[in-house]
């Protein structure tokens, strides 16, 4: 059968299961004259044989763990044993069977963890190796905690990444571990091959002793700092300490202040660098961060609170250069003339801002001094001795001392004596008739002019007219502005008119003075007027209850989950049909009747969050008017992206032969959200069989170093599998391959003879 089992000499690859006794030939090579026979060389291990007639076979079971690939060469020889064709590469790939059990590298592990360590952050790795192929279930290891001792309230304080063997705290462990209560724990860990999924898997166990140590990385107590300190700066105000020496400390100002008056030294001591001013800012909240030598955060940041304590460094201030009040000439003793309100920038409700008022001078002192008094703490001026007469003294000037506990300020008050308010405002007509307006009349439109007159002294509070709508407009849709020179009132629309809720409104106006009327005079019907507002219907679009609706869900919610809802009402009371617009990713559907929004496809934060769509509310029937609102779906991150290489690493090479062990640095990334601290990847070799030649060591949360363990490498390409684990919840792992070529170099570059230009590495190590 030419083709599958026989044929001419050409490069070929065959796959054979290990552990199987030979049952058939591998291939029958056919010779072309002058070739008469074949020769087999390479990694035969005395297992692979070629017969004179070109029959390639193997004579005993293969062992993948001894050699996973046999690189053979077959040449066609003439009758003199001289090569006339080839040699060509024949690759025998040995397929794995589960013939090796996993074994822990240590029968006992010891580690320590600080209380309150971040959940999911590994503090210890157990490591088992299985000589079987890690690319198959046979070599895929699955770690489990068999038992935790002691187990308090049946709560697990520790968890293990079942792929990497990374041991970390659970959320409960982070919160509850306390060395004072229980300083040590023991875990029994099992490892199974077959990814833990088969009853035929092999297993091993190991013991882990864990010491719990105190965590001193804690937020200090809030600090109080007196403002305007005259002590030499910087002044130490508090401190933070990382659990181990060598941390690099920094402060983060979340508020992005133009002036950030704090610093931290490399001991963790925090300083205020300049005097603070409570009146500029009365409290600061910032963060202390501890980082490793590579600039990666060691833990969560600590919140530092600084409260600025007030001192009395501000005098009282007057509300204006001169405060003007009016008093009618017949006002009674004790009547309030007005209140002088001074200010103090010092802290409210403290002695530093508590003010006293005192009249220090009255001019003129006619008919006598002491006509006025001021309430010491309230600042209210009252008539103290007798009624005043305008023709005798039309104006008084008071100098008032306002003081806090340390400062005094003089404020000036002018009191104008005005005629008695014995005339009421009188409307020029009592009924302004009917006014018909469409409900969509613009806000701000003047719809009516009203006029009343007052015979009291012009340009005083006795003759000034204020118009109020006292009836017929409980919604406050209308307002009246008064022209201070003419006392004309302009009725304006302040809120949209609405046919549906108020088709006809009987409006009543009242005209009144800011000054009280004299005793015995009262407002009567002359001070009231009415008009009827008739609103006509306009077919209006539905109205959403919000301009933007927002909802927040986890990106891994099940399809069909309700993720939010919108509501709109039609002013005419018609039913509403809801629809979506701009659902470019096809993630959502809306219930046409209720406005509830559901997911119809897997959501993905990494594709973009928030996801913005438009919701449309359309009248059912009528003129089918519609309106549009926004729906913003904020997607919360789930650890659903395994780590990967940050860039393309094809083209890595070492010059062959190696004169000394070499190394190269690579970077990992993933697409999940890494808020304050950035990714915290852990790195390990993807297969136990790589450990003789390579080692991988973590540099920081994103970078690692791949190093050779020796210099005896063949001149060929090696594919190094590396496991990268993100330590997330749940932890995800990516297996990536770094192709590394060992090649002859010319001037530091890989040398390839002409005709072999494919895949030339471009990066030398």
């Amino acid at each position: 059968q030419e083709g599958k089992f026989s044929g001419p000499l050409k490069p070929m690859t065959f796959s054979i299961y290990e552990g199987q006794e030979p049952s058939q030939i591998i291939f029958q090579f056919k010779a072309n004259p002058p070739a008469v026979t074949f020769e087999l060389t390479g990694e035969t291990d005395n297992i692979f044989v070629i017969e004179r007639e070109g029959l390639l076979y193997y004579n005993r079971a293969l062992d993948r763990e001894t050699r996973s690939t046999h690189n053979l060469q077959v040449a066609a020889l003439d009758a003199n044993g001289i090569i006339v064709e080839g040699p060509v590469p024949i690759t025998i790939k040995v397929k794995d069977i589960n013939d090796n059990r996993p074994t822990f590298l240590q029968s006992k592990y010891e580690g320590s963890v600080r209380q309150n360590s971040r959940p999911g952050k590994p503090f210890l790795y157990v490591n088992a190796t299985d000589l079987d192929d890690p690319a198959t279930p046979n070599g895929q290891l699955y770690y489990q905690i068999v038992i935790q001792l002691p187990m308090i309230n049946n709560v697990m304080y520790f968890q293990i990444n079942n792929k990497t063997g990374a041991i970390s705290l659970t959320r409960e462990g982070s919160q509850e571990l306390n060395p004072a209560k229980n300083p040590s724990y023991n875990l029994v860990i099992s490892v199974k091959d077959m990814g833990g999924q088969s009853e035929n898997s092999f297993s091993d166990t190991t013991s882990v002793d864990i010491i719990v140590t105190e965590n001193i990385w804690k937020a200090p107590k809030p600090v109080e700092m007196v403002e305007n300190s005259t002590d030499p700066h910087p002044i130490k105000i508090t401190q933070v300490r990382w659990n181990d020496p060598g941390a690099q400390y920094s402060l983060v100002d979340k508020e992005k202040l133009p002036r950030f008056p704090f610093s931290i030294d490399q001991e963790g001591d925090i300083y205020v660098t300049q005097p603070l001013d409570r009146e500029e800012k009365d409290a600061y909240v910032f963060y202390a961060v501890a980082k490793d030598e590579y600039g990666k955060p060691l833990s969560y940041p600590l919140e530092i609170h600084v409260k600025v304590k007030d001192i009395n460094d501000n005098p009282p201030t007057c509300p204006s250069p001169v405060t003007v009040f009016e008093v009618q000439e017949n006002e009674r003793l004790g009547n309030s003339i007005g209140t002088l309100t001074a200010h103090d920038r010092d802290e409210e409700n403290t002695a530093n801002s508590f003010l006293n008022y005192r009249i220090v001078e009255q001019t003129p002192k006619l008919p006598m001094d002491g006509l006025f008094l001021i309430q010491t703490y309230a600042g209210m001026l009252q008539l103290a001795k007798q009624s005043l007469k305008k023709q005798d003294t039309p104006q008084y000037n008071l100098t008032i001392e306002v003081s806090d506990k340390d400062f005094k300020t003089l404020c000036f008050v002018q009191i104008n004596v005005i005629d008695i308010n014995d005339q009421i405002p009188i409307f020029e007509k009592s009924d302004y008739g009917n006014l018909t307006l469409a409900e969509d009349t613009n806000i701000g439109s003047t719809i009516l002019t009203i006029q009343a007159t007052d015979a009291d002294e012009p340009f005083t509070g006795s003759s000034k007219i204020l118009y109020h709508i006292i009836k017929g407009d409980s919604e406050g849709r209308l307002g009246v502005d008064t022209d201070p020179h003419t006392n004309t009132g302009y009725v304006i629309i302040k809120k949209p008119l609405d046919f549906e809720t108020a088709a006809v409104s009987n409006i009543v106006f009242k005209a009144e003075n800011p000054e009280p009327l004299v005793f015995g005079v009262k407002y009567n019907a002359s001070s009231f007027a009415k008009f009827t507002l008739i609103v006509t219907d306009v077919n209006e679009a539905p109205q959403f209850s919000q301009h933007v609706f927002q909802a927040k869900v986890s990106e891994d919610v099940a399809i069909g989950t309700k993720v939010g809802n919108v509501t709109a009402k039609d002013p005419e009371g018609l039913d509403i049909s809801y629809s979506l617009r701009g659902d470019t990713r096809g993630w959502l559907k809306i219930d046409h009747v209720t406005g509830e929004i559901f997911s119809v496809a897997p959501l993905d934060r990494e594709a973009g969050s928030p996801y913005r769509v438009q919701v449309v509310a359309t009248e059912v029937g009528g003129s089918s008017l519609s309106s549009v609102s926004e729906f913003h779906l904020i997607l919360m991150d789930v650890n659903d992206n395994p780590p990967r290489l940050a860039k393309d690493y094809t083209g890595l090479f070492f010059c062959h032969p190696l004169s000394a062990p070499g190394s190269l640095i690579f970077e990992a990334t993933d697409d999940d959200q890494h808020l304050f601290r950035g990714p915290h990847f852990t790195f390990s070799l993807g297969s136990g069989s790589l450990q003789n030649d390579w080692e991988v060591s973590k540099i920081n949360g994103t970078h690692a170093r791949l190093s050779t363990r020796h210099t005896e490498f063949e001149e060929r390409e090696y594919v190094v599998l590396i496991r990268i684990n993100d330590g997330g919840r749940p932890p995800l792992e990516g297996i990536v391959s770094l192709p590394v070529t060992f090649c002859s170099c010319v001037e530091g570059s890989c040398f390839r003879p002409a005709g072999h230009q494919t895949g030339i590495p471009t990066v030398g190590m």
Epitope: V36, N80, I82
Partner: antibody, heavy 123, light 107 residues
């Protein structure tokens, strides 16, 4: 023991042909190749070509392709070389020799030689 | 074709001497090289194959070395019966080619 017995010396006229024989004994003719060499007085050896009697495969030196024809007769365990269109340049001693290699061996080289056949081309 | 050069056509020697005869190939032949001894009016005899392997029955005073393009035949303790022509041959590729020979003479 292995022996290669060549035919006797030949005196031939220019333009004529000659066929030299090489009879082997002590082994099977089809197991090894037979090579032919030319040696002129006080000169080095020139390789003419070989024949593999088992499959009648031949390979020639380009310089002798037109001049020589190699054959073998398995029944008589004899190899032959015919030289045609002879000129004085063809006057030389011609050797046959067995190539030592066979499948499974690591020996190479011409391990057994005939005694040589002198060919003289003269009018 | 691969040219085999034996630069010393003649070499004078004395019984008991150590003699080294060289052969240079015009291109890499690996170890596909044989040495032959030819005495006057006799056929050549195979001494060395694969550059360094002694053929059956060859005395151990004959040693071959080298690979690639440069090869040496050494006679460690010259005897009178060793006076002969020594010829190298490559069998890396066709056509097979011989060196011109080096003749050993008594000084």
């Amino acid at each position: 023991q292995v022996q290669l017995q060549q035919s006797d010396a030949e005196l031939v006229k220019p333009g004529a042909s000659v066929k030299i024989s090489c009879k082997v004994s002590g082994y099977t003719l089809t197991d090894h190749t037979i090579h032919w060499m030319k040696q002129r007085p006080d000169q080095g050896l020139d390789w003419i070509g070989y024949i593999y009697p088992r499959d009648d495969i031949t390979q020639y030196n380009e310089n002798f392709k037109a001049k020589s024809t190699l054959t073998a007769d398995k029944s008589s365990s004899t190899a032959y070389m015919q030289l045609n269109s002879l000129t004085s340049e063809d006057s030389a001693v011609y050797f046959c020799a067995r190539w030592s290699w066979h499948f499974g061996s690591n020996y190479y080289g011409l391990d057994y030689w005939g005694q040589g056949t002198s060919v003289t081309v003269s009018s | 074709d691969i040219v085999m050069t034996q630069s010393q056509t003649f070499m004078s020697t004395t019984v008991g001497d150590r003699v080294s005869i060289t052969c240079k190939a015009s291109q890499n032949v690996g170890t596909a090289l044989a040495w032959y001894q030819q005495k006057p009016r006799q056929s050549p005899k195979l001494l060395i194959y694969s550059a360094s392997n002694r053929f059956t029955g060859v005395p151990d005073r004959f040693t071959g070395s080298g690979s690639g393009t440069d090869f040496t035949l050494t006679i460690s303790n010259m005897r009178s019966e060793d006076l002969a022509d020594y010829v190298c041959q490559q069998y890396s590729t066709y056509p097979l080619t011989f060196g011109s020979g080096t003749k050993l003479e008594i000084r």
